[in-house]
């Protein structure tokens, strides 16, 4: 059950796991949600009736019964973890806390013009968890405008005290706002030889990497596989850090894999949930419950529904089965990871999916796609929308992409002659245009935001945002696509697809079924040679075959150029313009989305 409301002047009695300091009850709830065992919490707000040393304490709690006795206490605010809540949970916290000094290890002190600049510095510093900034009104003249970057072992302050004329806040890495590069590759046969901050058991390097990403101090990791020669270290995931933020030494070692935290590329971050099921593997841990179920998937669902369950083992041993049902062992541990991993067993293991609604929905696995055909299948491009105009009659106008639960990214040139957002309708989860009837539900458009430097498609800035009147509930057939990370400007995308209901040749009509075409990216240098009469800027990106034959065309405008990188789909381009359609040596020209990430974030996150 998902309980979101906070209980004022209420304290949960007992069940304490640990105490951390948070600047607000809201943030205490987020910390509880991400903690492997926390189900409930009690936060103490500042109050004259309360001992100041207890102000801002956030006590994380657990209970076998999933609840605890309530006691009335002034200034106490209690609530439940967001584990199992179906709405999106995010660690992103943009709040600025006035007159609060969030204490931690100050590791960088420098002058900044504003609190915003200080927060940006923190967001772009690999070690920074939070900051404190002394404002222009700070009593000590010499400390005015000083920006202190801080970190701690837990990622939360070691203490929070009142202090006039300072402001504090958190790094916005988890809000997709970091400009740090993120390295998504996992390096085989590699050991990073730096200091270990923690170690856990993991079934593979991908799980190890996700654990590293969500661990506040982890910057990179080394994972020893099942074939690692030293038996005691098999399946060990070492979470590491270094002063420089990068590994100081890489050692070539067979059967080890290493990689980096993806904390700085949170808009394509792996969620803190591991959906894969591991056959022939036993996850050891504290026994929570044993139940008979039919099949490993039902076992995983059972674990997910039981809020305290962290991982499970489904046994196929004859003595553990009755007819079609077998034993499902529901387990937990202190850190959320198995305490041991055994191979060669008759059964399968996996993790609870209770935190799969955290992070960005854009990273959630999409159904396997059918490659080779030209018609798409349902759910293949769940971010693709069809934008209709109702004036003078209803028709498909342009494509677009869902990038947030209230936002569609499309091309500016689509709105030539569109006087008002009232005539627009956005349809999502559509495969065939014929599905759209009078009674088909759609999203009204509240606002059209066209880039203020846009003049015409060929001169660039061909980008627009549509703010929807209502929010999109994410499902398998409608969910967002990730924006590319600014740190990934140098990534060479090799798996790019253009989609839309546009013409299949220059003189044609809108297609009924959503079409797809795999198209290679072309360098801007090469593209410029093909369009000598135009200026191909770095804010444009080109794609097409030299011989032509596959391309976007009229009606595809505004739709996505989607590229898959490290199992995550990114919105690399917006269909913009081109000479004809699929002509030889005339690539399609797309708006280069990575160059507009700041603009998108500025517009979508404006208060």
């Amino acid at each position: 059950e998902c309980v979101t409301q906070l209980l004022k002047d209420t304290c949960f009695e007992g069940g304490d796991i640990t105490t951390v300091f948070t600047p607000s009850a809201k943030y205490c709830q987020v910390v509880c949600t991400y903690h492997p065992r926390c189900l409930l919490f009690t936060f103490t707000a500042e109050s004259p009736s309360e001992d100041p040393t207890r102000w801002f304490t956030c006590v994380l709690k657990d209970s076998v019964t999933e609840t605890l006795p309530r006691v009335n206490r002034t200034a106490a605010i209690s609530g439940y973890s967001f584990k199992q809540c179906s709405h999106q949970i995010s660690a992103c916290n943009k709040d600025i806390y006035v007159d609060l000094d969030m204490k931690g290890i100050n590791y960088n002190s420098s002058v900044a013009k504003s609190a915003q600049e200080c927060q940006e510095r923190c967001t772009d510093d690999v070690h920074c968890h939070f900051f404190t900034y002394a404002t222009r009104q700070f009593p000590s003249l010499e400390h005015r405008n000083i920006c202190l970057l801080k970190h701690t072992q837990t990622g939360t302050p070691t203490r929070i005290t009142k202090l006039d004329k300072v402001v504090s806040g958190f790094s916005l890495k988890s809000c997709a706002l970091s400009n740090l590069a993120c390295i998504r590759d996992i390096f085989p046969n590699t050991v990073f030889a730096d200091s270990n901050i923690d170690s856990v058991m993991a079934p593979d390097a991908f799980v190890c990497g996700r654990i590293c990403t969500h661990h506040p101090g982890c910057l990179f990791f080394t994972f020893f596989s099942q074939e690692w020669p030293k038996e005691s270290q098999r399946n060990l995931c070492l979470l590491k850090t270094s002063e420089s933020g990068l590994p100081s030494t890489r050692i070539k070692k067979s059967k080890a894999l290493s990689g980096f935290s993806l904390q700085s590329c949170r808009h394509s971050i792996p969620v803190p949930c591991h959906s894969k099921i591991y056959p022939g593997v036993d996850f050891g841990g504290e026994e929570l419950n044993v139940t008979f179920v039919k099949g490993v998937n039902v076992c995983q669902e059972t674990c997910t529904k039981m809020i305290r369950c962290q991982f499970f083992t489904y046994s196929l041993l004859p003595e553990d089965c009755k007819e079609e049902k077998c034993k499902c062992f529901l387990r937990l541990s202190m850190d959320g990871s198995p305490t041991r991993i055994a191979y060669g067993t008759q059964g399968s293991s996996g993790y609870s999916l209770r935190l799969c609604n955290t992070g960005d929905n854009c990273t959630t696995k999409i159904k396997p796609r059918i490659v080779g055909g030209t018609a798409s299948v349902r759910g293949e491009w769940p971010w693709q929308v069809t934008l209709h105009t109702t004036s003078p009659t209803q028709r498909h106008l342009c494509g677009g992409s869902i990038i947030g639960n209230q936002w569609i990214l499309t091309a500016a040139h689509c709105f030539y002659g569109v006087e008002s957002p009232k005539i627009l309708r956005v349809y999502s989860g559509i495969l065939n245009q014929s599905e759209i009837k009078e009674d088909t539900s759609f999203f009204g458009v509240q606002e059209i935001i066209i880039h203020d430097q846009y003049k015409m498609a060929e001169s660039g800035y061909d980008i627009a945002l549509l703010k929807l009147e209502t929010t999109v509930n994410y499902t398998d057939s409608q969910r967002p696509i990730c924006l590319p990370s600014k740190g990934d400007r140098n990534v060479i995308y090799t798996d790019c697809w253009v989609t839309g209901w546009g013409y299949r040749k220059l003189r044609d009509k809108i297609q009924n079924t959503l079409q797809k075409a795999k198209i290679p990216l072309v360098t801007n240098e090469e593209c410029q040679k093909r369009y000598r009469g135009h200026k191909i800027t770095h804010k444009m990106i080109c794609a097409g075959y030299r011989e032509g034959g596959k391309d976007a065309c009229k009606g595809d405008s505004g739709g996505p150029l989607s590229c898959k990188h490290n199992e995550v789909w990114h919105l690399v381009g917006i269909t913009s313009w081109g000479e004809g359609c699929a002509q030889r040596e005339r690539p399609g020209v797309y708006t280069n989305v990575v160059e507009y990430v700041d603009w998108i974030l500025e517009k979508t996150q404006a208060v």
Partner: antibody, heavy 116, light 107 residues
């Protein structure tokens, strides 16, 4: 935990130079300023100078010409150098960590005697 | 440079008494004044910073007040372990400076 420890020569002859090292642990010198304060026997505290996290320095006006403060962030060490020592420079020398201009952690101090 | 003056070099008190130590700055230092306690043979210990903020672990019998040029440090109920020398320090502007100190002794 936070610790500061001063180490100095103990005895210096007049007109000679002084070099004292403050070795810190439990925090980073890039994030905190470090102060030098001295206390002559039976007297009060005198502020000598400081080095900020970003390397800037500030000195006591009366001693500015004789003082130099530097640091090595990687070794977690701060150095106080003072030349042309006189007998009235005899004192206990402390290093302390900055907290918004106040000094929240102090070393135990090192005693310097200027005598021939 | 800013000069900090503690008018009383010595103050006599008894256990349980309320005692106030004053400090005057030669120019406006806003609220950037700290107070330290020093016992014989020990390093100074920060009690109060920015006029009225108690350092971690400092008992609440120690308080500070004032602004501009006049500052007061108060012990609401003196304990035997409070007998020591107390210094004020301005941390408004470098070069920072200390007061001459006030020795709190048994009556």
């Amino acid at each position: 935990q936070v610790q500061l420890e001063e180490s100095g020569p103990g005895l210096v002859a007049p007109s000679q130079s002084l070099s004292i090292t403050c070795t810190v642990s439990g925090f980073s010198l890039t994030g905190y300023g470090i102060y030098w304060v001295r206390q002559p026997p039976g007297k009060g505290l005198e502020w000598l100078g400081m080095i900020w996290g970003d390397g800037r320095t500030d000195y006591n006006s009366a001693l500015k010409s004789r003082l130099s403060i530097s640091k090595d962030n990687s070794k977690s060490q701060v150095f106080l150098k003072m030349n042309s020592l006189q007998t009235d420079d005899t004192a206990r020398y402390y290093c302390a960590r900055d907290y918004y201009g106040s000094k929240d952690y102090w070393g135990q101090g090192t005693t310097l005697t200027v005598s021939s | 440079d800013i000069v900090m003056t503690q008018s009383h070099k010595f103050m006599s008190t008894s256990v349980g008494d309320r005692v106030s130590i004053t400090c005057k700055a030669s120019q406006d230092v806003s609220t950037a004044v700290a107070w330290y306690q020093q016992k014989p043979g020990q390093s100074p210990k920060l009690l109060i910073y920015l006029t009225s903020y108690r350092n971690t672990g400092v008992p609440d019998r120690f308080t500070g007040s004032g602004s501009g040029t006049d500052f007061t440090f108060t012990i609401s109920s003196v304990q035997a372990e409070d007998l020591a020398v107390y210094y004020c320090q301005q941390h408004y502007k470098t070069p920072y400076s200390f007061g001459g100190g006030t020795k709190l002794e048994r009556l």
